[in-house]
């Protein structure tokens, strides 16, 4: 069948590196400087992709695969096959239409990028709060209030907890 | 073929001005938003300033007051007037176009200039 299908279509014996060049008979040409052919049988080769500006190069194209790339830093990568490039902010931050702005009161950020999330509320899952959040830190859930009952247990109570989602400033 | 090619570069002391331009060609200019970038040895590139279609600005926070981007859609032109120059403003300017219109984010279908030296020092 192979030979049948090639004997139909001498382009498809042209391998990946190559294109099948309509202009001289069909021979497999190699692909120009500067792009690529994934795959056998094309009748024309890709451009490579060029990664520019914040975009740097972290794999060079070759005559059979695209280059890719990453983002310099300071920056990280966003969509598939990082089609974007977004600047970092620093923890405690997110990135608005403005700039890297701080987390509102009530939400934190952990990493460079993202939104700013809102606190675990403890007491929804009948906890009281161990730990305050900050910017940077989400609250740390203690035991519930009924757990620090004198008697109810024999684990030393933490500190007087204070209302969820409180944090001095 | 798309083209952008910055100037006004140059050497500058504390406290003094420069204008950037960056001259586009190959691409409907007047319909595209653009931007400029910085890029320092020590702290790699920084988002600086943008600009819509429609003339609205935006600007990172430490250039606010200081820098004012404008364009002239006439000339193809985008321009960075910088004021009040300090030392940590020394950096190569780049201009490019500003497809994704986010707050520091630029996408592979960009296009960017070689860029412009900027250093201020006394």
């Known amino acids: 069948f192979e030979r049948t299908r090639s004997l139909q279509d001498p382009c498809s014996n042209c391998p990946a590196g190559t294109f099948c060049d309509n202009n001289r008979n069909q021979i497999c040409s190699p692909c120009p400087p500067n792009s690529f052919s994934s795959a056998g049988g094309q009748r024309t080769c890709d451009i490579c992709r060029q990664c520019k500006g914040v975009f740097r190069t972290r794999k060079e194209c070759s005559s059979t695969s695209n280059a890719e790339c990453d983002c310099t830093p300071g920056f990280h990568c966003l969509g598939a096959g990082c089609s974007m490039c977004e600047q970092d902010c620093k923890q405690g931050q997110e990135l608005t239409k403005k700039g890297c702005k701080d987390c509102c009161f009530g939400t934190f950020n952990d990493q460079k990028r993202g939104i700013c999330r809102p606190w675990t509320n403890c007491s929804l899952d009948g906890k009281s709060v161990l730990v305050n959040g900050t910017k940077e830190r989400d609250v740390v859930c203690g035991p519930s209030p009924a757990d620090l009952s004198p008697g109810a247990s024999s684990v030393t109570p933490p500190a007087p907890a204070r209302e969820p989602g409180h944090s001095p400033q | 073929e798309v083209q952008l090619v910055e100037s006004g570069g140059g050497l500058v002391q504390p406290g003094g001005s420069l204008r950037l331009s960056c001259a586009a060609s190959g691409f409907t200019f007047s319909s595209s938003a653009m931007s400029w970038a910085r890029q320092t040895p020590g702290k790699g590139f920084e988002w600086v300033s943008g600009i819509y279609s429609d003339g609205s600005t935006y600007y990172t926070d430490s250039v606010k007051d200081r820098f004012t981007i404008s364009r002239d859609n006439a000339k193809n032109t985008v321009y960075l007037q910088m004021n009040s120059l300090k030392p940590e403003d020394t950096a190569v300017y780049y201009c490019?176009?500003?497809?994704?219109?986010?707050?520091?984010?630029?996408?592979?279908?960009?296009?960017w200039g070689q860029g412009t030296q900027v250093t201020v020092s006394s």
């Open positions: 490019a176009t500003w497809g994704t219109l986010r707050f520091g984010v630029w996408a592979e279908y960009d296009h």
